[in-house]
């Protein structure tokens, strides 16, 4: 998920006098913005850890890889990267860790070649539904995005303004069906409690989906059926208790899939029988020999692959008349 980079020795820093001398004129084609490093040979501009509060206006037209990490951007307004002439070559944009809390509709408009976008490690309390689609039409022009990295974008709990964070993110992913070509989606470390059921069906080109380190309890209402190209599904470090038959069958039906399930609190009772049977037969789960029970207490740390049906019992539920106080 990282973009190509170039060695620091090939970068030229902007001269302060140059920046001020041309501030009132259109940018020169090979100009480097103040506080950035530029390599025309590598088509790369790095404005990293410079406390920038706005996207530089004078980005060179040749830029293909733009790193704007570790800044103080706060807001990405509409057309934040719109330039005349446009940044027609810009393919990889990394905005991680730049204290963004608001991304407005059309923030990435006029970037016809943008394939990789990384917004990780920004507390996105206000992500417009039209941040990626650019318009509120029911069907927007297709986005060129192929890779969207949204790891750890959840704001602090008291800053979510009583809205569903999952819902806000999914609205941005689905608006206008603009992201039909998306192949990689990373949503790790976002405290997701659930995955809205329609999200995957509308991202049919996905090859890699990372949902690790969330708080997903169940996949019962999530369908993977349409994701025929899916190659990797990361579900490590969630709160999954069991995978049911429907999910198991759908995963087994995906031709290229590898699933990662480590570090979930599996509940090894009678409901786990189907999953254990499936695990013993399937090749799709990576590191399946590492999966262990968390509950009930008597089963803690037992390896799932070593269980048999006799191990997987459920305590009988007494009818109300037989229950004692």
């Amino acid at each position: 998920s990282s973009s190509p980079t170039s060695s620091a020795s090939s970068f030229s820093s902007s001269a302060p006098f140059l920046a001020s001398a041309v501030s009132a004129q259109p940018p020169l084609p090979d100009q480097c913005p103040a506080l950035c490093e530029c390599s025309e040979a590598a088509r790369t501009v790095k404005c990293v850890n410079r406390n920038l509060t706005e996207v530089p206006t004078d980005l060179p037209a040749y830029v293909r890889n733009l790193f704007l990490t570790g800044n103080q951007l706060a807001v990405l307004p509409a057309g934040a990267f719109a330039r005349r002439p446009p940044l027609a070559e810009l393919a990889a944009l990394n905005l991680s860790g730049s204290r963004l809390d608001e991304v407005r509709a059309g923030a990435f408009e006029h970037l016809p070649s943008l394939r990789q976008l990384d917004l990780s490690h920004n507390p996105l309390a206000d992500l417009s539904p039209f941040a990626f689609s650019g318009s509120n039409a029911s069907v927007s022009a297709p986005s060129p995005l192929v890779e969207l990295i949204l790891n750890h974008i959840v704001p602090p709990e008291d800053e979510r303004q009583n809205r569903s964070f999952e819902g806000m993110v999914v609205a941005a992913l689905l608006a206008g069906r603009a992201l039909q070509g998306l192949r990689r989606l990373e949503l790790a470390s976002n405290h997701f409690l659930y995955l809205p059921r329609d999200v995957l069906a509308q991202l049919p080109s996905l090859r890699h989906l990372d949902l690790s380190n969330n708080s997903l309890v169940s996949l019962t209402y999530v369908s993977f059926r349409n994701l025929t190209h899916l190659e990797s599904l990361h579900l490590e470090d969630n709160a999954l208790k069991v995978l049911h038959n429907g999910t198991l069958a759908e995963l087994q039906g995906l031709p290229h899939i590898r699933v990662f399930l480590d570090n979930n609190p599996w509940v090894c009772d009678c409901h786990m029988a189907d999953m254990v049977t499936w695990l013993k037969e399937t090749e799709v789960v990576q590191g399946k020999d590492r999966l262990t029970c968390a509950y009930p207490e008597k089963m803690r740390n037992r390896v799932l692959l070593e269980l048999n049906s006799a191990d997987l019992d459920c305590d009988p539920i007494l009818p109300p008349s037989l229950q004692t106080s």
Epitope: T53, L73, E102, P156, E159
Partner: nanobody
Amino acid sequence: QVQLVQSGGGLVQAGGSLRLSCAASRRPFSSKTMAWFRQTPGKEREFVAAVRWIGGATRYTDSVKGRFSISKDNAINTVYLQMNSLKSEDTAVYYCAAGQAWGTKFTDYSDWGQGTQVTVKP
């Protein structure tokens, strides 16, 4: 409308320090940015520093960079301006402000504190 109540300020020798506080009566979700401005007689209010409530992004006018520091305490809806290495040209009435934008113009801010005098003796 949110009420902004300022405290701090006063008279200080050049090279000294002061801390200003600005407490919001409630945390307005519509006001995403808190800022400090200053004004000297006959001049327009000048932007000094700003901070975002959520992301904590900060920005400063060039003349105070490295000397002033803006911070916030979300739990008590309060913003601070720590002013070090004060110069006589920092003498002004300082105002805190709340607004939606991530801007440096006073028109970006809708709610204002009452102002507090800072005087730096040469």
